[in-house]
């Protein structure tokens, strides 16, 4: 039975040209995390594998940095970075947990962070 929950940074906004940290946290389970995938709807951004270590997709390596922790830092943001991001935790023996973050990249200098929320 999957008992864990993923807490994410939720709906967040950031300024064009700036950077943002995408963070997820898996709690309420003793399952072993074997890999975390960071994905957009159509492609893989990065993986952090217990054995392979961090791997950033080549098309993102100039502006994506691993960490902090299992999170991901997006740099030099553009308006095209607006959209959904998913952290996918592969665990044993529970299976897969997924968290969703919506990032809005704003032209203006006003960028406020959304509230944290949980996905069971």
């Amino acid at each position: 039975m999957m008992t864990g929950t993923i807490e994410t940074t939720g709906n967040i906004s950031a300024e064009k040209g700036g950077s943002i940290i995408l963070q997820c946290h898996l709690s309420s389970t003793t399952a072993q995390v074997t890999q975390v995938n960071w994905e957009q709807q159509d492609q893989l951004l990065a993986i952090c594998n217990a054995d392979l270590g961090w791997h950033i997709s080549p098309s993102f390596k100039d502006r994506v940095a691993p960490g902090p922790g299992l999170g991901l830092t997006l740099q030099s943001l553009t308006v095209n970075d607006t959209g959904e991001y998913f952290c996918i935790y592969h665990t044993y023996p529970d299976g897969t947990y997924t968290g969703r973050i919506f990032l809005e990249v704003l032209e203006s200098s006003v960028a406020e962070h959304g509230a944290r929320f949980q996905i069971p």
Epitope: N37, E39, Q43, L44, P58, Y97, R100
Partner: antibody
Framework: QVQLQQPGAELVKPGASVKMSCKAS????????MHWVKQTPGRGLEWIGA????????SYNQKFKGKATLTADKSSSTAYMQLSSLTSEDSAVYYC?????????????WGAGTTVTVSA | DIVMTQSPDSLAVSLGERATINCKSS????????????LAWYQQKPGQPPKLLIY???TRESGVPDRFSGSGSGTDFTLTISSLQAEDVAVYYC?????????FGGGTKLEIK
């Protein structure tokens, strides 16, 4: 264009070891994980494991732990797989395959395969 | 490990007719969080490595003819060739790329009737 070059065949004696190569060209070798797949008429396609050429980190299918050892040489853009204590069960075609940014286990690029024959 | 089961083992279809290959996984390949199915289809011709045809259960890889289509979700998937051509004679494999270890179906041999 992406190319993965593998030697065509290896003939080895039971109990011996074999080290096969996969030379990558047409892309930055350390930017992509390299996977290895075994194919036999009886068992079909089996994923052996993967290596992160940048860090040297490896991940194995439990079934092939102790049988296969994956390494990579960044200077020559070549991935290697060593198989030890060979038996007739190890006679197969072995492919190296590069992953796709749509998924870390998705393989659009394959070597031509190395046919390993274990025979006294 | 996720077990991938294909049916039928072999299939003979007349040129120009429809060919349908099924694949069933022992666990769901649908990630309910992002609504993606981590299922791929490959084509393999004699003496060649597998060729990626479909990923995400239904998205054609670049350069793949539109007579190839994939459908299904969760544990049940289908590869359809709408009008069989002579060059489609091959073995077709489904693959789980949802979780380690990545696993393949046993293959379906497609021949011309």
């Amino acid at each position: 264009q992406v190319q993965l070059q593998q030697p065509g065949a290896e003939l080895v004696k039971p109990g011996a070891s074999v080290k096969m190569s996969c030379k990558a060209s047409g892309y930055a070798f350390t930017d992509y994980l390299m996977h290895w797949v075994k194919q036999t008429p009886g068992r079909g396609l089996e994923w052996i494991g993967a290596i992160n050429p940048g860090s040297g980190g490896t991940s194995y299918n439990q079934k092939f732990k102790g049988k296969a050892t994956l390494t990579a040489d960044k200077s020559s853009s070549t991935a290697y797989m060593q198989l030890s204590s060979l038996t007739s069960e190890d006679s197969a075609v072995y492919y190296c395959a590069r992953y796709h940014y749509y998924g870390s286990g998705l393989f659009p690029y394959w070597g031509a395969g190395t046919t390993v024959t274990v025979s006294a | 490990d996720i077990v991938m089961t294909q049916s039928p083992d072999s299939l003979a279809v007349s040129l120009g007719e429809r060919a349908t290959i099924n694949c069933k996984s022992s666990q769901s390949l649908l990630n309910s969080g992002n609504q993606k199915n981590y299922l791929a289809w490959y084509q393999q011709k004699p003496g060649q490595p597998p060729k990626l045809l479909i990923y995400g259960a239904s998205t054609r890889e670049s350069g793949v003819p539109d007579r190839f289509s994939g459908s299904g979700s969760g544990t049940d998937f289908t590869l359809t060739i709408s009008s069989l051509q002579a060059e489609d004679v091959a073995v077709y494999y489904c693959q789980n790329y949802h979780s380690y270890p990545f696993t393949f179906g046993g293959g379906t041999k497609l021949e011309i009737k």
